[in-house]
């Protein structure tokens, strides 16, 4: 038995489990998912059995190999995978562990403004990103750019502080998790902050 | 100093295959998007298609799809397209790009290596 | 896809002109544009992203503007080294697309 192996896999997509045995004599060979049976192949009779229907055409195993694909993931595909290997000139069966975490291609970030401030003509509010849907594992990173600076702030909340006759700042909130990358509209600073400008001491949403 | 080296080019026969190599080197391979680019002779830019860090996500130009395959070993620090089907018109210089900071935009490119399909 | 149009395809100039090149993308892609300078016999070098942004070491007679779909690099004063194709790229949708160059030559 080796060590746990992670794969990655996009919803959609397909990801292969590989497997290499020394085994000389298999009689056969279980995949599980989450403790429930998978797939069984007899190498012998050239037999698979595919547990439950609606995985029949997702499961394949390429080059004639023990290998497994599994194709058109889905989120709930993300879980713990074991396989066995039986032979009878072993005591005990050869087993390999995965994990499969199973993301979500990302759509556009969105971007929303908390309490705004204008003091002494700088407009001072948080803008926060977020994935609509609720996505895990998102790491999010803001781009702040203009003449004065091209910076990157991680986190979904950025602080901005902007003073008006100031040159105009754009910011763009970048979203990625393992397997996609997107990023949200930009937002400039001198709309973002006109709200506030006739009122030096107005607070709003 | 960050490089990336391509290599593999050559001439080939239509109909042929052929697989490039990009070395890569003076950064941490394994936590960029890679993306392949070629130029035909005279010609513009021609996104190809990029794979994400862990192999799990491949985009590709829709027209090129069904021929080329672009795969990577983080292990070997390679990134590789394997072309199948060439012609006449897949003759070009083909690049491997990094993009800055693992946005969209590419700041490291490698030399290019010269595919020819010719009879 | 999203088609790039870069005019004029190719043009010249004298030394210490200024040098506009307009790129045109077919739909919306706010500000999701890269240009690039391609020297005779060389490879690419990013010079601009997100439609305005420099990049590093990048002199500061490049510049660029635009969103949407009408974006412009402007050179404020043409130097000799400056002579290449440039191509912008918008990254907004794939398969991310590039414009078919402009050439600049010195009169």
């Known amino acids: 038995s080796g060590p746990v192996k992670e794969l990655v896999g996009s919803v959609g997509g397909a990801v292969t489990f590989p497997l290499k045995s020394k085994v000389k004599q298999v009689d056969s060979i279980v995949w599980t998912f989450n403790t429930t049976p998978l797939v069984t192949i007899q190498p012998e009779g050239g037999t698979i059995i595919v547990t439950q229907n609606r995985n029949r055409e997702r499961v394949d195993f390429p080059d004639g190999g023990y290998s497994l694909k599994l194709s058109k993931l889905k989120k709930n595909d993300s879980g713990i995978y074991y396989v066995g290997i039986y032979s009878s000139s072993l005591q005990q069966p050869s087993t390999q562990e995965y994990v499969l975490h199973v993301y979500e291609h990302l759509s556009k970030p969105k971007v929303t403004m908390g309490l705004q401030s204008n003091k002494n003509g700088t407009c001072v509010t948080n803008l926060t990103c977020c994935m609509e849907h609720g996505e895990e594992d998102v790491i999010y990173t803001w781009k702040a750019l203009g003449q004065a600076a091209n910076e990157s702030h991680n986190g979904s909340i950025l602080p901005i502080s902007w003073r008006w006759g100031e040159s105009d700042m754009t910011f763009i909130c970048v979203a990625r998790n393992p397997v996609s990358r997107n990023f949200s509209s930009p937002i400039l600073a001198r709309k973002l902050c006109e709200g506030a400008a006739d009122d030096p001491d107005s607070s709003m949403v | 100093e960050v490089q990336l080296v391509e290599s593999g080019g050559g001439l080939v026969q239509p109909g042929g295959s052929l697989r490039l190599s990009c070395a890569a080197s003076?950064?941490?391979?394994?936590?960029?998007?890679m993306s392949w680019v070629r130029q035909a002779p005279g010609k513009g830019l021609e996104w190809i298609g990029e794979i994400n860090p862990d192999s799990s996500t491949i985009n590709y130009t829709p027209s090129l799809k069904d021929k080329f395959i672009i795969s990577r070993d983080n292990a070997k620090n390679s990134l590789y397209l394997q072309m199948n089907s060439l012609r006449a018109e897949d003759t070009a210089v083909y690049y491997c790009a990094r993009p800055d900071g693992n946005y969209w935009y590419f700041d490291v490119w490698g030399q290019g290596t010269l595919v020819t399909v010719s009879s | 896809d999203i088609q790039m149009t870069q005019s004029p395809s190719s043009l010249s100039a004298s030394v210490g002109d200024r040098v506009t090149i307009t790129c045109k993308a077919s739909q919306d892609v706010g500000i999701a544009v890269a240009w690039y300078q391609q020297k005779p016999g060389k490879v690419p070098k990013l010079l601009i992203y997100?439609?305005?942004t420099r990049h590093t070491g990048v002199p500061d007679r490049f510049s660029g503007s635009g969103s949407g779909t009408d974006f412009t690099l402007t050179i404020s004063s043409l130097q000799p080294e400056d002579v290449a194709t440039y191509y912008c790229?918008?990254?907004?949708?794939?398969?991310?697309?590039f414009g078919q160059g402009t050439k600049v030559e010195i009169k």
């Open positions: 997100w439609a305005s």
């Open positions: 790229q918008q990254y907004s949708s794939y398969p991310y697309t």
């Open positions: 003076g950064f941490d391979f394994s936590r960029y998007w």
